[in-house]
């Protein structure tokens, strides 16, 4: 499968949407930074066939989207912005899974690796409970923002090395 | 390879104008901030103030506040250290700084190889 | 600001020797607080970050350790390249902050 050109380019502009996000100066929560433990490994392409990493992949985004779609989430940013980060999450998952069908009887591993997929949620939690812990207070956004801007980043490495797979 | 290459040495009288520079390459420019550090002759390293390239919001050491302005243009990748009025004791070596912003990453972990700046009559 | 506090400001010490040096925040900066080593005339490289993380090809005979006000540098056993000035740093809040620095000479 070929991940169109067209989910590159979401992957840029949902970097870009993200850049735009920020409602304070984040060098008011310095002291905010948190260690939620990225799963480089995951990200590292290396150990696992082409199925299981879009499935990683789509694991991400499917969390970004649904870490984005609370009510805290909505009441912190800006609504004009959240529909455009909205649709270009959906148009990469739509991509992500049309790849996904494509590799059904392609390769003989399976098409999830299900430990990789565990350590993504558990990610995910780690800013959920951490976000939790402080109130869902501006400062905690803006330091989740620029963690999933780091994730973002590091996917779309990932992304780069599938394509140059084919 | 991650590197910040710094605009040559300068040396200037008193009362002139002077933008240094610091050319960042083999990362992506905008997902770190850039940080100033001055260091007087034979004295320990001081702040000056930082800026995120992304959108050019800055801060300042309030020592340093008013006396310098720092800029960035993402688009080659360059920040900026300025003065509009120099002074003799402005005299230093000035350092250039990647930091990872509020990432869970090593702060200032690669530095621009320095500009000195000497202000003399 | 938070003031950091470097002792000693000087050392002398020999090959081999096991050197430590100590810095003091004036407040509590939890574990952010970074190591830098200078040699004369080169800018300062990074050693030790969030108090006891290692920086990337440094090696394993530095480490730090501490938390909340009170923090140190260990150099295990002192080589040739490891005469230097030292800086604690602060980065909790701005202004970010340095120590005055720790030289390490030659006994």
């Known amino acids: 499968c070929d991940l169109p050109q067209t989910h590159s380019l979401s992957n840029r502009r949902t970097l870009m949407i993200m850049a735009q996000m920020g409602r304070i100066s984040p060098f008011s929560c310095l002291k905010d930074r948190h260690d939620f433990g990225f799963p480089q490994e995951e990200f590292d392409g290396n150990q696992f066939q082409k199925a299981q990493a879009i499935s990683v992949l789509h694991e991400m985004i499917q969390q970004t989207f649904n870490l984005f779609s609370t009510k805290d989430s909505s009441a912190t940013w800006d609504e004009t912005l959240l529909d455009k980060f909205y649709t270009e999450l959906y148009q990469q998952l739509n991509d992500l899974e049309a790849c996904m069908m494509q590799e059904v009887g392609v390769e003989d591993t399976p098409l999830m690796n299900v430990d990789s997929i565990l350590t993504v949620r558990k990610y995910f939690q780690r800013i959920t409970l951490y976000l939790t812990e402080k109130k869902y207070s501006p400062c905690a956004w803006e330091v989740v923002r620029a963690e999933i801007m780091r994730s973002f980043s590091l996917s779309a490495n990932l992304q780069e090395r599938l394509r140059r797979k084919e | 390879e991650v590197q910040l290459v710094q605009s040559g040495a300068e040396v200037k009288k008193p009362g002139e104008s002077l933008k240094i520079s610091c050319k960042g390459s083999g990362y992506s420019f905008t997902s770190y901030w850039i940080g100033w550090v001055r260091q007087m002759p034979g004295k320990g390293l001081e702040w000056m103030g930082i800026i995120d390239p992304s959108d050019s919001d800055t801060a300042y050491s309030p020592s340093f506040q008013g006396q310098v302005t720092i800029s960035a243009d993402k688009s080659i990748s360059t920040a900026y250290l300025q003065w509009s009025s120099l002074k003799a004791s402005d005299t230093a070596m000035y350092y250039c700084?990647?930091?990872?912003?509020?990432?869970?990453?090593?702060?200032?972990?690669?530095w621009g190889q320095g500009t000195l700046v000497t202000v003399s009559s | 600001d938070i003031q950091m506090t470097q002792s000693p400001s000087s050392l002398s010490a020999s090959v081999g020797d096991r050197v430590t040096i100590t810095c003091r925040a004036s407040q509590s900066i939890t574990n952010f607080l970074n190591w830098y080593q200078q040699k004369p005339g080169k800018a300062p490289k990074l050693l030790i970050y969030?108090?006891?993380s290692l920086q990337s090809g440094v090696p394993s005979r530095f480490s730090g350790s501490g938390s909340g006000t009170d923090f140190t540098l260990t150099i295990s056993s002192l080589q040739p390249e490891d005469f230097a000035t030292y800086y604690c740093?602060?980065?909790?809040?701005?202004?970010?902050?340095f120590g005055q620095g720790t030289k390490v000479e030659i006994k």
């Open positions: 740093q602060q980065s909790l809040d701005f202004p970010l902050t």
């Open positions: 969030f108090a006891s």
């Open positions: 700084a990647r930091h990872p912003g509020l990432n869970w990453a090593p702060d200032f972990d690669y």
